[in-house]
Interface confidence: medium
């Protein structure tokens, strides 16, 4: 159900009864001549468009009967000046879309008593206006003058939307708001114009920090970027690695994809220890054995886990017969005392 709301306004401006006669040419107060003093009130009937306007009910869009507004000829001010019970313009509220056409009947009637405003007595009729019109919604008044020879009625009319209603038929509703259900003002056609920082049909969706990842970030108010579980960073575009992940990366949260040369659940096991740390000394050959371990193959003359220790070939005292020993890189040399010779001075010259 689409609710719409507007009001047809009819402004009675001036009525002229030149001779003070009724429609049947009788004098309003009886007798044959003036002053007739027609105490004039009006019946207004607003109805759907009819090619031939019938003054008979029903007044499908509304009806109104005014109090006595003047005698014979008179002008009518705007507002409620004449009578507290009468407001000019006369308002006909609409709870449905304005169709753009209408029929209007305005009858000027006479009464002897201000309390007797019966409209059924044809003897009281001064004049009757019937018209049908096309009318678009707008603030501008349409002016009209109805002349019947003895009477003139000047009036104007318009159809305006109620506050917060827009569009050709006043069927577009828009009321500015700034709360949980919307942050917007209204455009000329009733379109919702989101306040800065808001978007969506009802302007309830905050616009997050520019650059905020639309999958992994969100916001409750404009300019924020809150990360969903497993994501981090100013724009929530960095995944959070598996806790304890050391030399790994992630494409999705809680991954630990090891960098080259690393292994294990936390990528903390060095698979290329030889290259990264060069632990073997003195020209030894390094071999990775996995899980962050290695072995060094020492060159002759060196020992130790990292070949960091030079082998002392004189340690076992190889030289005989009191010869002195000199340690060389991969061997030793014996300096023989007089009378001895040989590799370890084991031979006697004697």
């Amino acid at each position: 159900q689409v609710w719409s709301s507007g009001v047809f306004e009819l402004k009675l401006q001036e009525f002229v009864n030149k001779k003070g006669l009724l429609g049947n040419r009788n004098c309003c107060r009886g007798g044959s001549g003036p002053p007739c003093a027609c105490r004039t009130f009006f019946r207004v009937c607003l109805k759907h468009y009819q090619a031939s306007v019938s003054p008979e009910p029903p007044c499908t869009y509304g009806s109104a009967v005014t109090p006595v507004l003047g005698v014979d000829s008179f002008s009518l001010p705007d507002g409620a000046g004449i009578d507290p019970a009468f407001s000019n313009p006369i308002r006909f509220p609409f709870g449905f879309t304005w169709p753009g056409t209408f029929s209007l009947i305005i009858e000027a009637l006479h009464t002897d008593s201000p309390d007797d405003l019966a409209t059924e007595n044809p003897e009281r009729l001064i004049s009757r206006l019937t018209t049908q019109r096309h009318l678009t919604v707008g603030e501008e008044w349409s002016q009209d003058l109805h002349s019947s020879g003895r009477t003139d009625l000047r009036y104007s009319y318009r159809f305006v939307c109620d506050e917060h209603y827009y569009g050709e038929g006043c069927s577009v509703f828009c009321r500015p708001r700034d709360d949980a259900f919307g942050h917007f003002t209204c455009g000329d056609r009733g379109e919702k114009m989101c306040d800065p920082g808001w978007k969506g049909q009802y302007c309830t969706d905050p616009i997050c920090l520019p650059g905020c990842d639309d999958q992994h970030g969100y916001c409750d108010k404009p300019g924020e970027c809150k990360c969903r579980v497993g994501w981090q960073g100013r724009y929530c575009d960095e995944c959070i690695r598996y806790p304890g992940c050391l030399h790994g990366t992630c494409q999705q949260p809680w991954q630990c994809n090891c960098q080259e040369g690393w292994g294990g659940l936390f990528c903390n096991q060095d698979l290329n220890y030889c290259t990264h740390h060069k632990p073997c000394r003195n020209g030894a050959t390094c071999t990775n054995t996995g899980q962050g371990s290695y072995t060094c193959s020492c060159r002759p003359g060196y020992t130790g886990a990292n070949c960091e220790l030079e082998v002392d070939e004189c340690a076992p005292s190889p030289c005989k017969n009191g010869a002195s020993c000199t340690d060389l890189e991969d061997s030793f040399s014996c300096t023989c005392p007089p009378g001895f010779y040989g590799k370890v001075c084991e031979l006697s010259a004697m």
Partner: antibody
Framework: EVQLVESGGGLVQPGGSLRLSCAAS????????IHWVRQAPGKGLEWVGG????????DYANSVKGRFTISADTSKNTAYLQMNSLRAEDTAVYYC????????????????WGQGTLVTVSS | DIQMTQSPSSLSASVGDRVTITCRAS??????VAWYQQKPGKAPKLLIY???FLYSGVPSRFSGSGSGTDFTLTISSLQPEDFATYYC?????????FGQGTKVEIK
């Protein structure tokens, strides 16, 4: 005088349905939001959902989304809460309340409330 | 959803006492906070809207203050008819949420 009158409460079995009405009078129905708020026995207030009768825009709490539907008939100045697939935890007094929204005041509050209608979901 | 946490959950006071109830929002809600009073078996009544504006017809002993995340309802001089449960409510972000309530009892 502004008045909101709820009706339609009662005892219903789990899985059943019930329709609550909220008849409004004394104000222009289409100029306000109408909200439904419930209160389980001995508990606090919980917002159920709301409607803007002028354009039919609705919003719901996650706990009732897909089960409850709010509507309004502007010719009768009445809002409705259609409750389907009812559960024991839906047992509560259901209030309808009027909310004026005014861009000058963030958080205008619910200024008129109905007397409430009790909904009991039990087998 | 935004959580509204009221403290204390209950308090005992005497007629004439100054009573303060606080409400903390889990995130910034500007001044979009209303306070309600509820008596047993009755519907809530609006006391304060937009954090600090006294609703029409509410006695001036009630006042509200705060913005952002911290809000306060103060009753300057407690009267016998003020013994009730008080709720705060935010309407800054959907869905609107209420505090759990503060019961003010006679000491």
């Amino acid at each position: 005088e502004v008045q909101l009158v709820e009706s339609g409460g009662g005892l219903v079995q789990p899985g059943g349905s019930l329709r609550l009405s909220c008849a409004a009078s004394g104000f222009t129905f289409t100029s306000y939001d109408i909200h439904w708020v419930r209160q389980a026995p001995g508990k606090g207030l919980e917002w159920v959902g709301g409607i803007s009768p002028a354009d039919g825009d609705t919003d719901y709490a996650n706990s009732v989304k897909g089960r409850f539907t709010i509507s309004a008939d502007t010719s009768k100045n009445t809002a409705y809460l259609q409750m389907n697939s009812l559960r024991a935890e839906d047992t509560a007094v259901y209030y309808c309340a009027r909310n004026d929204y005014d861009v000058r005041f963030v958080g205008s509050g619910m200024d008129y409330w109905g007397q409430g209608t009790l909904v009991t979901v039990s087998s | 959803d935004i959580q509204m946490t009221q403290s204390p959950s209950s308090l005992s006071a005497s007629v004439g006492d100054r009573v303060t109830i606080t409400c903390r929002a889990s995130q910034d809600v500007s001044t979009a906070v209303a306070w309600y009073q509820q008596k047993p078996g009755k519907a809530p009544k609006l006391l304060i809207y937009s954090a600090s504006f006294l609703y029409s017809g509410v006695p001036s002993r009630f006042s509200g203050s705060g913005s952002g995340t911290d809000f306060t309802l103060t009753i300057s001089s407690l009267q016998p008819e003020d013994f009730a449960t008080y709720y705060c409510q935010q309407s800054f972000t959907a869905p609107p949420t209420f505090g759990q309530g503060t019961k003010v009892e006679i000491k």
